[in-house]
């Protein structure tokens, strides 16, 4: 066949769906690769063709759209499964073509099984709630387009294995789950199951997400440098190892980039000739406040190094701070005889 623009396997779109549930999958060409939509393509005389390669096979084959009860169908740029089977797993290709134009992309589809508590290999989206912040809601995700607005589905919410009922601060409200006051104890996996009828059959959509309760913006502060501080002096003799930790606390801030860096005499360590290594470690509190520690290390410090200015800097969306470390050269203890002589005023 003639040349076709092949966008390859779009592994960014690793689609995972549950066994025995409906799935609607849009052809990624129109979402990520082409500058026009399906309607434009269709009215220009282009045809959308679907085919697939089964798991652990190399052979591309057409999708069977003549299965009982139209189990697999295509509607515009959407491939429908009503419902999926485990062996639908494979790489799916959508190809847009006419006699003069061709473009195609493949994407992996994985049909997964869940256990009785909704655990599965599915990668879960994470929804962050602010601690003690007032009413916050999560919404049952990715259920648009499965049923018309005239259909009233039933929605059951679970936390882990258990239906959410009589919880003090979590209230199911249809497609939404309301947290009156989010607490650390609300951390966990939440599942909504949407049940709806279609053509005399009942379908279920299961969606699980992870809720993580994080620090509230009400309590957020600029970075706090715990070390270096005014109470600790780094007193070294030439030839010793100099180790200065910079420990900074960052309040949790949604989408904030937390940065810590050292300057030596106003320059980044990379820009100066001395042999400096910097090791960073990061720890998080239960509400995702962050503590970053950067340890500046000079293996064999010189008297020149001990005269330099060592400043720890930190920056977040809340502001920027800096703190200099107190570094000085240790004065060698005078020899005993000299000290005595001086003490007795000898000349």
């Amino acid at each position: 066949s003639e040349r076709c623009d092949d966008w390859g396997l779009d592994t960014m779109r690793q689609i995972q769906v549950f066994e025995d549930e409906p799935a609607r999958i849009k052809c990624p060409l129109f979402e990520h690769f082409l500058k026009f939509n399906y309607s434009t393509a269709h009215s220009a005389g282009l045809t959308l063709i679907w085919y697939w390669t089964r798991q652990d096979r190399d052979l591309e084959e057409p999708i069977n759209f003549r299965l009982p009860e139209n189990r697999i169908s295509k509607e515009k740029d959407v491939l429908w499964f009503r419902p999926t089977l485990l062996n639908d797993t494979g790489n799916y290709t959508c190809m847009l073509r006419n006699t003069t134009y061709c473009s195609k992309v493949a994407f992996p589809l994985e049909v997964v099984q869940k256990d009785s508590c909704f655990n599965s290999p599915m990668k879960l989206p994470v929804h962050k709630l602010y601690i003690e912040y007032g009413i916050q809601r999560i919404t049952c995700p990715n259920v648009d387009g499965y049923f018309p607005s005239s259909v009233k589905p039933t929605i059951t919410w679970y936390m882990g294995c258990y239906k959410i009922q009589n919880f003090n601060n979590v209230i199911p409200e249809g497609m939404n789950l309301s947290f009156l006051i989010a607490l650390i104890s609300n951390n966990g996996n939440y599942t909504c199951v949407v049940t709806y009828p279609e053509n005399g059959r009942t379908f279920h959509l299961t969606r699980t997400l992870t809720v993580k309760v994080v620090g509230s913006p009400k309590n957020a502060v600029p970075p706090v440098i715990h070390s270096p501080n005014d109470h600790v002096v780094y007193e070294k003799e030439p030839g010793e190892e100099l180790l200065i930790p910079c420990t900074v606390y960052f309040s949790f801030l949604m989408d904030s980039r937390n940065e810590v860096w050292w300057t030596i005499d106003g320059k980044k360590p990379d820009d100066i000739t001395i042999d400096v290594t910097i090791n960073e470690s990061i720890s998080h509190s239960r509400t995702e406040d962050e503590t970053r520690t950067q340890i500046l290390s000079i293996k064999k410090v010189t008297s020149e190094d001990l005269k330099r200015s060592y400043v720890c800097h930190a920056r977040s969306a809340k502001g920027e701070v800096a703190k200099a470390a107190k570094v000085k050269q240790k004065v060698p203890a005078p020899r005993y005889t000299v000290e005595l002589a001086c003490g007795f005023g000898a000349t």
Epitope: F18, E19, D20, P83, L85, L86, Q113, K114, D115, S116, C117, T154, T156, K163, Q165, N166, V193, T195, T202, H204
Partner: antibody, heavy 117, light 107 residues
């Protein structure tokens, strides 16, 4: 379409055991709960327990705990209910009922178990 | 266990009548209530799940309502094929429990 086909009627002696099968088709057997419900002659419905074939998780009604065993064979999409130490009051029609969640969406045709000496 | 009390235990109504069956739980069940229909000599069939959700293929003359401990099944216009026993069932807390049933007959 979903179909649950149960094994045939059984006549059992008191103190013995009975094992009723329920063969499922038309849905993903591993991904739904299989419930067992019984109905004594002229009486109402009584839930006995359920199993999730995907991971073997079971829940039993306290009344039947220790006397009933639910199992599932994923390779044949068949669920089993075994009731031991039978007594005359266990005479009933035993139903399997499939439910993706907790409601029992589809039921088998029922198996009559008669316990008589 | 949660007790489910259904009333009436039986009723007789004419074709076209509006029929109401009630079910009371011994404690709140948060709308986790199903209704089943069982015709003589047959297995039960799910009619309504989660208080008011019509199961696929069930005629729209059947409807459910209620909250807390009190729930209702309504047949808006009784048809001859509706002759059956109707059971409510709670699925709020294990073990699932059924009401005693309501036998519906045609006058």
């Amino acid at each position: 379409q979903v179909q649950l086909v149960q094994s045939g009627a059984e006549v059992k002696k008191p103190g013995s055991s009975v094992k009723v099968s329920c063969k499922a088709s038309g849905y993903a057997f591993s991904s739904s709960w299989m419930n067992w419900v019984r109905q004594a002659p002229g009486q109402g419905l009584e839930w006995m327990g359920r199993i999730y074939p995907g991971d073997g998780n079971t829940h039993y009604a306290q009344k039947f705990q220790g006397r009933v065993t639910l199992t599932a064979d994923k390779s044949t999409s068949t669920a089993y209910m075994e009731l031991s130490s039978l007594r005359s009051e266990d005479t009933a029609v035993y139903y399997c009922g499939e439910g993706y969640l907790d409601p029992m969406d589809y039921w088998g045709q029922g198996t009559l178990v008669t316990v008589s000496s | 266990d949660i007790q489910m009390t259904q009333s009436p235990s039986s009723l007789s109504a004419s074709v076209g009548d509006r029929v109401t069956i009630t079910c009371q739980a011994s404690q709140g069940i948060n709308n986790y209530l199903n209704w089943y229909q069982q015709k003589p000599g047959k297995a039960p069939k799910l009619l309504i799940h989660y208080t008011s959700g019509l199961h696929a293929g069930v005629p729209s003359r059947f409807s459910g309502s209620g909250s807390g401990t009190d729930y209702t099944l309504t047949i808006s216009s009784l048809e001859p094929e509706d002759v059956a026993t109707y059971y409510c069932q709670q699925y709020s807390i294990l073990p699932w429990t059924f009401g005693g049933g309501t036998k519906v007959e045609i006058k």
